[in-house]
Interface confidence: low
């Protein structure tokens, strides 16, 4: 047979037996001669070397490029291929002899003592136990031990060939600790030498790189890349790297097996691979592939090489972010660079410092925005190695739905007088401004609820057909003012008006403020009554501890049984089918509270007296009256406001002042407080008193010293004071230069 | 990723009631930061809008147009609607919806439109 | 109502080139309520910028808005092919009705 592609000049070594396989029988002679056309060289069994005694090759005596290959007695153990090949080529010819020895139908190894068989689990995967035959047509059956099972071949998946040997499934031996091949010649057995059953696993689990992504070095850094396998048990591993710069001088690899817990059912190997000093080369995917000769698995990871350490901001990075109060805002460092910078969040130029409200790491975290968080946030990117930093500002604004001042008043809102005008407002504080704020109205009649409409807390009109206001057919004729701008609380915000000229129909009023984030609405409950009518005695709000009176004064012809009633401070809910305005519809939120009754020629005065306001006395009290005729009940309702005791307080300093003889000197002071402070001036602890150039306005909180002498020189003290105590500031006044001297003198 | 379709009838009769409907998808026709409005073209000639709605329903009309438009919305089919009576030819056009980021703000979002013609 | 014009109704520029198109309005318009609009034929209008100079998601940094007042300006730094269009700039003033400009139409010269 011939092995290899021939040569365009060289033809193949020719032997002197032309036939592929040839039997003989033991103690016979072996010779076959080979002829070529270059130097030629002979293979044969158990000897790959070519030294062996018993065998001879001698150069033929009639030519050239001749061998001839003698083998004395030969034995069983010499059957096998020989094979004779030009020197330093592929091109050979190859004969196979059998050398029947019936006493030793196996060849024997060479080691003669046992062999080794390595085999895995898997169902998939036969092993080859190398009993070879030097009988091509030998009943052979394999025997595994202990406990001991014989498998015969099947003609399938069980099979021997004298040639190779015995092929089975290895999952078949994998619980036998050794195997030997038996062949039956005349009844009697021949045995193979033993060979040891070794269980290998191939299974890797999985291939990790570490470190796994975002490798970055510059010129001249240490490279460690480590390649862990984690295996079943019973495997070998064989890493293999590929990276780019393969000539690499300074690369060194490393590779050992990781000790794991005791009773653990895996194993771990690690190979690392180092660099010491990368250059732009070395930049690339590297990829390391561990192998246990059944499977393959590998992992990638990109290394990236930079010049030299650098940082800059990415394109994607903001210059204005827009949010919505109550929204969270993520404003991420966008960069490039190497290593990672330093990240420093400013806000207005003040370091930013974590807490429960903000995050400022790579990612600028603002849990629930709000107005005060507007401001222009510069991040400050250092390189940790080149110390070189980058600036970036971004401008966050922070945008505000309208908030309808006024819709924190919770309570309904007074009746009104019928014929008289009134002003409703709504006052729209927005984020930016809003685009408009619309009026709209509606009948209070037409708003009455539907049997099956339930009433929310929220949303207590259940109105659908609002109206227009300059669509005023059919109810109170209205002008809309144009918007106002008032700075009110530090705030600057939009105060819409809308002017009843004759409040002639109940009504409820809308107001509807909408800006680019959203919108915000109130509603506005304007009951008209031309019954009772309310009145305040003294006619201002009463601060807590004084008195007050709420008289109710109704026409005696039209109206009778006046009672005062107090609305609770949590209505009931309201019934469905039910009109939450006006109370008059709606008893059952009110309280019934004691009066005194007085009569003049015309009208009856119901009045009922608060001694010593509290501010749980707040609320809205209702008076209500029936009509004689037609008992109809008319109700009127008042919000009574109590202001709060406040001790005296006086904004802003006195300043110590200089001041040269003969100028004037004018200081304010204002003082808070409920009930409004008394303000007194002391001089040097003495009461100062008004005279020519002493003048004391608007209620002592101004004080002009006209013409100042030298006497005029002092520690100046304003002093607030009210029943709930006092409160002062001081300073002195120094007065320069001389005194002018006088005609008296 | 939101998107808009118009449908309707392609060809309306002079006098007739021209009737569009905008179905959303991707996207709640019920959010309270949204408002949706119908801008047409005539063919050859500029934008103009007609109006705008909330979810609630409340609409916002070109003064132009306000006698003969109603824009109405059904939360539940996520649409809205668009009638223009008395038509003329002059109301020929390619009718568009659009989502509005706010009332009165930039259309952000449209729908690809419909030709309305016209004509007896 | 607030009329929007634009000018001039037609730009002839060449790719790579520079594109300025106004818009003047008839009286003061808030900076934060005008957009500008790009329409090529047969599709809806796409949004380019809001409240003046605000580039909308998606558009490229060669387009740019500026202006205060009555006078805005939309500044294409380079053109490139797909640019040649229809441009409409659009207010969303406090009072209605919202309103747009008549357009530019910027062709390749």
């Known amino acids: 047979a011939s092995v290899g592609l021939p040569s365009v000049s060289l033809d193949l070594p020719r032997l002197s037996i032309q036939k592929d396989i040839l039997t003989i029988k033991a103690n016979t002679t072996l010779q076959i001669t080979c002829r070529g056309q270059r130097d030629l060289d002979w293979l044969w069994p158990n000897n790959q070397s070519g030294s062996e005694q018993r065998v001879e090759v001698t150069e033929c005596s009639d030519g050239l490029f001749c061998k001839t290959l003698t083998i004395p007695k030969v034995i069983g153990n010499d059957t096998g291929a020989y094979k004779c090949f030009y020197r330093e080529t592929d091109l050979a010819s190859v004969i196979y002899v059998y050398v029947q020895d019936y006493r030793s139908p196996f060849i024997a190894s060479v080691s003669d003592q046992h062999g080794v068989v390595y085999i895995t689990e898997n169902k998939n995967k036969t092993v080859v136990i190398p009993c070879l035959g030097s009988i091509s047509n030998l009943n052979v059956s394999l025997c595994a031990r202990y406990p001991e099972k014989r498998f015969v071949p099947d003609g399938n998946r069980i099979s021997w060939d004298s040639k190779k040997g015995f092929t089975i499934p290895s999952y078949m031996i994998s619980y036998a600790g050794m195997v030997f091949c038996e062949a039956k010649i005349n009844d009697e057995s021949y045995q193979s030498i033993m060979y040891i059953v070794v269980v290998v696993g191939y299974r890797i689990y999985d291939v990790v790189l570490s470190p796994s992504h975002g490798i970055e070095l510059s010129v001249g850094e240490k490279l460690v890349l480590n390649c862990t396998a984690r295996t079943e048990l019973n495997v070998g591993i064989d890493f293999n790297w590929e990276y780019p710069s393969s000539k690499h001088q300074h690369k060194k690899l490393v590779n050992r097996d990781l000790k794991t817990q005791s009773g653990s059912e895996m194993k771990k190997f690690l190979s690392t691979l180092t660099i010491d000093g990368v250059t732009r080369s070395d930049q690339g995917l590297y990829t390391c592939a561990a192998s246990s000769g059944l499977m393959t698995k590998k992992n990638s990871t990109f290394v990236r090489v930079h010049e030299k350490p650098f940082v800059a901001f990415g394109s994607g990075m903001e210059s204005l972010v827009e949010a919505t109060v109550g929204e969270r805002v993520r404003i991420p460092a966008k960069y490039l660079g190497y290593p990672p910078p330093e990240i420093k969040w400013y806000k207005n130029g003040i370091p930013l410092e974590s807490n429960h409200t903000i995050k400022a790491g790579h990612v600028l975290t603002i849990m629930e925005v709000s107005e005060r968080d507007t401001g222009n946030y510069t991040v400050i990117l250092t390189n940790p190695i080149s110390k070189e930093k980058q600036s970036h500002v971004v401008s966050l604004v922070v945008y505000v739905p309208p908030q309808i001042g006024e819709k924190s008043l919770i309570s309904p809102v007074d009746s009104y007088q019928y014929g008289t005008t009134q002003t409703l407002t709504c006052t729209v504080y927005a984020i930016p401004p809003p685009h408009h704020i619309h009026w709209y109205w509606q009948l209070e009649e037409e708003c009455a609820n539907e049997p099956s409409q339930a009433v929310s807390v929220t949303n207590p009109y259940p109105c659908e057909e609002w109206r227009s206001v300059e669509d005023f057919q059919g109810g109170n004729k209205i002008e809309v003012n144009k918007n106002q701008f008032a700075l009110i609380e530090g705030k600057n915000k939009t105060v819409s008006t809308l002017v009843i000229q004759a409040a002639n129909v109940s009504a409820l009023y809308k107001c509807e403020a909408v800006n680019k984030v959203g919108r915000g609405e109130r509603v506005i409950s304007f009951h008209v009554t031309r019954g009772p009518e309310i009145t305040l005695q003294p006619d201002m709000q009463p601060t807590e501890q004084e008195s007050v009176s709420l008289w109710c004064t109704a026409d005696r012809s039209t109206f009778e049984n006046l009672t005062w009633y107090k609305l609770g401070p949590q209505p009931l809910p309201i019934h469905v089918g039910e009109l939450p305005t006006p109370v008059c519809k709606n008893l059952d939120t009110l309280w019934k509270l004691n009066a005194t009754m007085f009569s003049n020629s015309t009208n009856d005065i119901l009045i009922m007296e608060l001694k010593n306001a509290s501010l749980q006395d707040q609320g809205d009290y209702v008076c209500l009256a029936q009509d004689r005729k037609t008992k109809k009940r008319h109700c009127v309702v008042r919000q009574l406001t109590v202001l709060e005791r406040v001790a005296p307080t006086i904004t802003g300093n006195l300043e110590n002042q200089t001041t040269s003889i003969g100028e004037s000197i004018e200081v304010s002071c204002t003082a808070s407080g409920n009930p409004p402070p008394q303000i007194m001036w002391f001089k040097d602890n003495e009461t100062l008193v008004e005279d020519s150039g002493i003048v004391l306005k608007d209620g002592n909180r101004n004080l002009t010293i006209r013409r100042v002498r030298k006497e005029d020189e002092g520690l100046y003290t304003c002093q607030a004071c009210s029943v709930l105590g006092c409160a002062k500031v001081e300073a002195f006044f120094i007065i320069e230069g001389a005194q002018e001297k006088t005609n008296l003198e | 990723q939101l998107q808009l379709q118009e449908s309707g009838p392609g060809l309306v009769k002079p006098s007739e009631t021209l009737s569009l409907t905008c179905t959303v998808s991707g996207g709640s026709i019920s959010s309270r930061s949204d408002y949706w409005g119908w801008i047409r073209q005539p063919p050859g000639k500029g934008l103009e809008w007609i109006g705008t709605?909330?979810?609630?329903?409340?609409?916002y009309y070109n003064p132009s147009l306000k006698s003969r438009v109603t824009i109405s919305v059904d939360t539940s089919k996520n649409q809205f609607s668009l009638k223009l009576s008395s038509v003329t030819a002059a109301d020929t056009a390619v009718y568009y919806c659009?989502?509005?980021?706010?009332?009165?703000?930039?259309?952000?979002?449209w729908g690809q439109g419909t030709l309305v013609t016209v004509s007896s | 109502e607030i009329v929007l014009t634009q000018s001039p109704g037609t730009l002839s520029l060449s790719p790579g080139e520079r594109a300025t198109l106004s818009c003047r309005a008839s009286?003061?318009?808030?900076?934060?309520?005008l957009a500008w609009y790009q329409q090529k034929p047969g599709q809806a209008p796409r949004l380019l910028i809001y409240?003046?100079?605000n580039r909308a998601t998606g558009i490229p940094d060669r387009f740019s808005g500026s202006g205060s007042g009555t006078d805005f300006t939309l500044t294409i730094s380079r053109l490139e092919p797909e640019d040649f269009a229809v441009y409409y700039c659009?207010?969303?003033?406090?009072?209605?009705?919202?309103?747009f400009g008549g357009g530019t139409k910027v062709e390749i010269k």
């Open positions: 009286q003061s318009v808030s900076s934060s309520y």
């Open positions: 659009q207010q969303h003033g406090s009072s209605p009705p919202l309103t």
């Open positions: 659009a989502r509005q980021q706010l009332v009165l703000y930039y259309f952000d979002y």
């Open positions: 409240a003046t100079s």
């Open positions: 709605i909330y979810y609630s329903g409340d609409t």
